[in-house]
Amino acid sequence: QTAPVPMPDLKNVKSKIGSTENLKHQPGGGKVQIINKKLDLSNVQSKCGSKDNIKHVPGGGSVQIVYKPVDLSKVTSKCGSLGNIHHKPGGGQVEVKSEKLDFKDRVQSKIGSLDNITHVPGGGNKKIE
């Protein structure tokens, strides 16, 4: 007859995964709190410090590639200009336009202006007196 095996003392044994510490834990299991709070965006400024782009909708993927000759002779910073006002940043759907436009079309808005009819091309100090 085998001797009875004494019951092990378990009072100092910790669960491997610390389950006793987590005894009172209530898993969220999907308990999601949605806060429907209106954000005050009235003081948000665009990178250029203007509100020009306030109605801008990011294309989130629509890229427009336009094949146009580019006149770089009068390139200025995007900030402080309206040059970028119609830009749609994007990333995926690609629309390729093979539109042939010459340099005249690029500078069409300047043709006939006082600056255009007084200053020679590439002329230095431009000043309307």
Epitope: L114, N116, T118, H119, G123, G124
Partner: antibody, heavy 112, light 106 residues
């Protein structure tokens, strides 16, 4: 200050040629187109042509192509307009202009 | 050639009266410029780039228009405004002037 100096009057005979001058001062001469304009007595203004003083490039009103020749002398900042085969129809005031500034005009009289 | 037609050719206005003159182009232009010429003097640039006043031009003058139809307006006529006004285009060669509007005072 910007000035465009033109001789007041020129009297020439029919069939002859004349070279009108326009001396510019007070600004960088080669930076600006020089235009020439004709005005007959009691009439309106007619654009003759212009010249780029940097390289001598010219544009002419077709009407004046065989009549006027535009040139410049960069060293003296002077623009010239030569008029050939003169007739009474060429009697007029001729202005050189930078558009924002105008010369006083040269009164050309073609008479025998 | 882009023909500029000004109307009326001659007009007169009383002091304080509003004055409008027009310039019609046979082809569209990007900008219209206006010159004032008082009798027996050289023309002066008066309005440039359609609506900008040249240096020293009184604020009662204004310019407007687009395409092939442009106008110069004086909000309240003054005696010193008596002159001939010419429109001018530089949008295509040859550059051209209108025939002028002679403004007189009543």
């Amino acid at each position: 200050q910007v000035q465009l100096q033109q001789p007041g009057t020129e009297l020439v005979k029919p069939g002859a040629s004349v070279k009108l001058s326009c001396k510019a001062s007070g600004y960088p001469f080669t930076n600006y187109w020089m235009h020439w304009v004709k005005q007959r007595p009691g009439q309106g203004l007619e654009w003759i042509g212009n010249i780029n003083p940097t390289n001598g490039d010219t544009n002419y009103n077709e009407k004046f192509k065989s009549k006027a020749t535009l040139t410049v002398d960069k060293s003296s900042s002077t623009a010239y307009m030569q008029l050939s085969s003169l007739t009474s129809e060429d009697s007029a005031v001729y202005y050189c202009t930078r558009v924002t500034y105008w010369g006083q005009g040269t009164t050309l009289t073609v008479s025998s | 050639e882009n023909v500029l037609t000004q109307s009326p050719a001659i007009m007169s206005a009383s002091p304080g009266e509003k004055v409008t003159m027009t310039c019609s182009a046979s082809s569209n232009v990007n900008y219209m410029h206006w010159f004032q010429q008082e009798s027996s003097t050289s023309p002066k640039l008066w309005i440039y780039d359609t609506s900008k006043l040249a240096s020293g031009v009184p604020g009662r003058f204004s310019g407007s228009g687009s395409g092939n139809s442009y106008s110069l307006t004086i909000s309240s006529m003054e005696a010193e405004d008596v002159a001939t006004y010419y429109c001018f285009q530089g949008s295509g060669y040859p550059y051209t002037f209108g025939g002028g509007t002679k403004l007189e005072i009543k």
